[in-house]
């Protein structure tokens, strides 16, 4: 999802001139040191170069940068902010640089900004304001189209002590910002639970990716706002069934895709909804995928070939006839 | 912006085949859906169909079913619609639209069917 | 299918007038109503979706109302590049369908 550039020839600086232009102003459209630039392709790459800050000499052209495989550390306010502006940035890749910090208006005078990538990065504190740039209650509206943030989850040690999931939710709604967002990545953060507010506040969802998470249910959760949701991906979570109310959610969404695969679905009476429905939408793909992972006695068996009689639940004996 | 550049005009007789093209283009903001849209000389406009290009998953007006086949090919970021058996009736504009709500839509392709 | 009624089939206004055009669908389409613009030999172009939320790019003279079977698309202030003829259509119940147009002409 992150921009590739057209195979134009790219200039690389010389590092050693690094230090005597560093003193004088930039010029308008050299390279930074240890970058290459392709100004056919408005594209600027300074990957896998242990950068420990963003250069301060962008060239004014620049539409796609990658700055992928750094040692960042920081993102501090105003990290891309220049005089003249980066008016032309369209495209911003920062995964694998080691960010653990993003602060407030980090994105700040990049009115072109439509595509952010901060994947791969252990983002123990990300700025409620990362992304509106301020803590006015409705900010104004941030260009961003897409924005990707799969496994920006810390190590449990380096997370500060407050929710991870509710960390990013903050971010992602703060000032009401990100009222145009298209495509939201959220995949391999070990999120337990999607906060109920998240995607009200995001109507112009077309694409979330909630892979390879460990959400338990989306019971709480609703869709009905992404009116034009096109793509739902929940596959290699801890999902158990899905009830009525997501199931009929869901299927009110007509442009909606979901990904269900390998979730651990339990196949007890609680799952006849969900089977039902499965045998009649076309919303799912691969639904002839999905399997059964409990109780035992069902497990690896294909949910659209159950029928009610499979799906039975223990029944709960009363207090008086429970044995010790 | 996306941008949909559908393939030139054609003339076919009656009975026979037309596959025609649509190139997307401005991919990162494009829509999963590509729809296809019917409008014949004068008249008004007709849903034919649509492929969700990721999985390959289509919808079909059952107008059309039977003798419309929509594809995409992923990897030239291309979607196909084939209208077989032919009639005089099916001369018309065929458009591509991109997106759920048809965002952005292609130029057109006339399709002329003639003995 | 549904069955999409749009009206009137044509008009005439001047510039700076208020125009509406109406469509009603043969059965609930919730919210799912998009109104689109069509001018000879260009593209055809997304004005409004959802009934009511305008597509990125266009001019906020053009808004959208309604829900149900009853909607309404109205330009606040006629320009005379908005000469043109505009679809509704449903995209709740497949199989999407459209209005029958209406053609709007400058007096």
């Known amino acids: 999802s992150s921009p590739t550039s057209s195979a134009s020839s790219f200039s690389s600086s010389a590092p050693f001139l690094a230090s005597a232009v560093s003193a004088q102003p930039p010029l308008p459209d050299q390279c930074p040191a240890l970058c290459e630039c392709s100004e056919a392709a408005r594209t600027v790459k300074c990957v896998n170069r242990n950068l420990t800050e963003v250069p301060t000499d962008l060239p004014a052209y620049v539409r796609n940068l990658f700055l992928t495989g750094n040692q960042l550390a920081v993102l501090p306010a105003g990290a891309f902010a220049r005089r003249p502006p980066l008016a032309e940035l369209a495209a911003l890749n920062l995964s694998g640089s080691r960010l653990d910090e993003v602060r407030a208006g980090a994105f700040e005078h990049l009115p072109s900004l439509r595509q952010l990538d901060l994947s791969h990065n252990p983002l123990a504190d990300l700025s409620p304001f990362a992304f509106s740039g301020s803590n006015a209650s409705v900010s104004a509206p941030s260009p961003l189209v897409e924005l990707i943030l799969n496994h920006i989850v810390p190590p449990e040690d380096e997370r500060q002590n407050r929710s991870f999931e509710g960390m990013v939710v903050a971010a992602l709604l703060a000032g009401r910002a990100l009222q145009g967002l298209r495509r939201l990545e959220l995949a391999s953060n070990h999120f337990l639970y999607l906060p109920r507010d998240v995607l009200a506040q995001l109507p112009s969802l077309r694409h979330l990716d909630l892979s390879n998470n460990s959400l338990v249910s989306l019971t709480y959760v609703s869709f009905r706002n992404l009116t034009h949701l096109e793509s739902l991906h929940l596959e290699d979570n801890a999902l158990k069934v899905l009830h009525n109310g997501t199931l009929a959610e869901l299927q009110g969404l007509p442009h909606i895709r979901v990904f269900l695969d390998n979730n651990p679905w339990v196949c007890d009476c609680h799952m006849a909804d969900m089977v039902t429905w499965l045998k009649e939408t076309e919303v799912v793909q691969g639904k002839d995928r999905l399997t059964c992972a409990y109780p035992e006695k069902m497990r690896n068996r294909v949910l659209l070939e159950l029928n009610s009689a499979d799906l039975d639940c223990d029944p709960i004996l009363p207090p008086s006839l429970q044995t010790s | 912006e996306v941008q949909l550049v559908q393939s030139g005009a054609e003339v076919k007789k009656p009975g026979a085949t037309v596959k025609i093209s649509c190139k997307v283009s401005?991919?990162?903001?494009?829509?999963?859906?590509m729809n296809w849209v019917q409008q014949a000389p004068g008249k008004g406009l007709e849903w034919i169909g649509r492929i969700y290009r990721e999985d390959g998953h289509t919808n079909y007006n059952g107008k059309f079913k039977g003798r419309v086949t929509i594809t995409a090919d992923t990897s030239t970021d291309t979607a196909y619609m084939e209208l077989s058996s032919l009639r005089s009736e099916d001369t018309a504009v065929y458009f591509c639209?991109?997106?759920?709500?048809?965002?952005?839509w292609g130029q057109g392709t006339l399709v002329t069917v003639s003995s | 299918d549904i069955q999409m009624t749009q009206s009137p089939s044509s008009l005439s206004a001047s510039v700076g007038d208020r125009v509406t055009i109406s469509c009603r669908a043969s059965q609930d389409i919730s919210n799912y109503l998009n109104w689109y613009q069509q001018k000879p030999g260009k593209a055809v172009k997304l004005l409004i979706y959802?009934?009511?939320r305008l597509h990125s790019g266009v001019p906020s003279r053009f808004s959208g109302s309604g829900s149900g079977t009853d909607f309404t698309f109205t330009i606040s202030s006629l320009q005379p590049e908005d000469i043109a003829t505009y679809f509704c259509?449903?995209?709740?119940?497949?199989?999407?369908?459209f209005g029958g147009g209406t053609k709007l002409e400058i007096k």
């Open positions: 259509q449903q995209d709740n119940t497949l199989p999407w369908t």
């Open positions: 639209a991109n997106g759920g709500a048809m965002d952005y």
């Open positions: 959802y009934t009511s």
């Open positions: 401005g991919y990162a903001f494009s829509s999963s859906w």
